[in-house]
């Protein structure tokens, strides 16, 4: 049935970059300016995305593909296809609804985005603090007394960071 219908449907012959114009006896017409069709057989063309505000154009719209946006410096992309721009903060800060705020004591953020995370608790691994943490950096855990035997490694790397994200306010 599908094959029979497609043979009878003149619109199925319209390639990407065109639309099947009902007003002109289903002739394949080129997409108007600022519109596109990424697949064949479409009866309308889609309006091109406009990269406004701090969105900037990463890829121009063409007759067969939509524009792509990214965010201007000071902001970063969020969402599928960069559907939103979110402001950057400095290292040692996290973004809240009140803007960028310094990490509380005992937490750090070494990126321009994401949340402040607690310093690694060295004592949970039976280790001591070799280098104190800051707002921008995790603590560095040093050897436990048992590790001080010859040939033992003197520093363990900090625990792997969680994927940054925002916690609810």
């Amino acid at each position: 049935f599908e094959r029979t219908r497609s043979l009878q449907d003149p619109c199925s012959n319209c390639p990407a970059g065109t639309f099947c114009d009902n007003n002109r006896n289903q002739i394949c017409s080129p997409c108007p300016p600022n519109s596109f069709s990424s697949a064949g057989g479409q009866r309308t063309c889609d309006i091109c995305r406009q990269c406004k505000g701090v969105f900037r154009t990463r890829k121009e719209c063409s007759s067969t593909s939509n524009a792509e946006c990214d965010c201007t410096p000071g902001f970063h992309c969020l969402g599928a296809g960069c559907s939103m721009c979110e402001q950057d903060c400095k290292q040692g800060q996290e973004l809240t609804k009140k803007g960028c705020k310094d990490c509380c004591f005992g937490t750090f953020n070494d990126q321009k985005r994401g949340i402040c995370r607690p310093w690694t608790n060295c004592s949970l691994d039976g280790k001591s603090v070799l280098v104190n943490g800051t707002k921008e950096r995790d603590v560095v855990c040093g050897p436990s007394p048992a590790d001080l035997s010859p040939g033992a490694s003197s520093v363990t790397p900090p625990a792997p960071a969680r994927e940054p994200g925002h916690s609810p306010q």
Epitope: G53, S83, H166, Q169
Partner: nanobody, 123 residues
Amino acid sequence: EVQLVESGGGLVQPGGSLRLSCAASGFTFRSYWMNWVRQAPGKEAEWVANINPDGSEKYYVDSVQGRHTISRDNAKNSLFLEMNSLRVEDTALYYCARGGPGYGDLHYGMDVWGQGTTVTVSS
């Protein structure tokens, strides 16, 4: 079509005042957090202020706190930024931006932007 249109920018002397407006259309304005963001020539874009859907919460970047006031009129689908005691460093292109779905809970991303209105503070 979802749209934001800013107006009210202009040339003003230091110490002067301006009121920026943003007309929203194509979406339920009263349901969204709204923001003002600015970009000075040659500098990174900077968030300026935001306001929650009913206007009861307002927050500002430190550099404008006490000088600028964000407000909204949900009946008229409008956002405002009252700018007082203007400084040369307030010179920028000012954008109105809608907080995306989940703003304030899941993220602080902005999904709809206007074209901006230019504020120039110069003697």
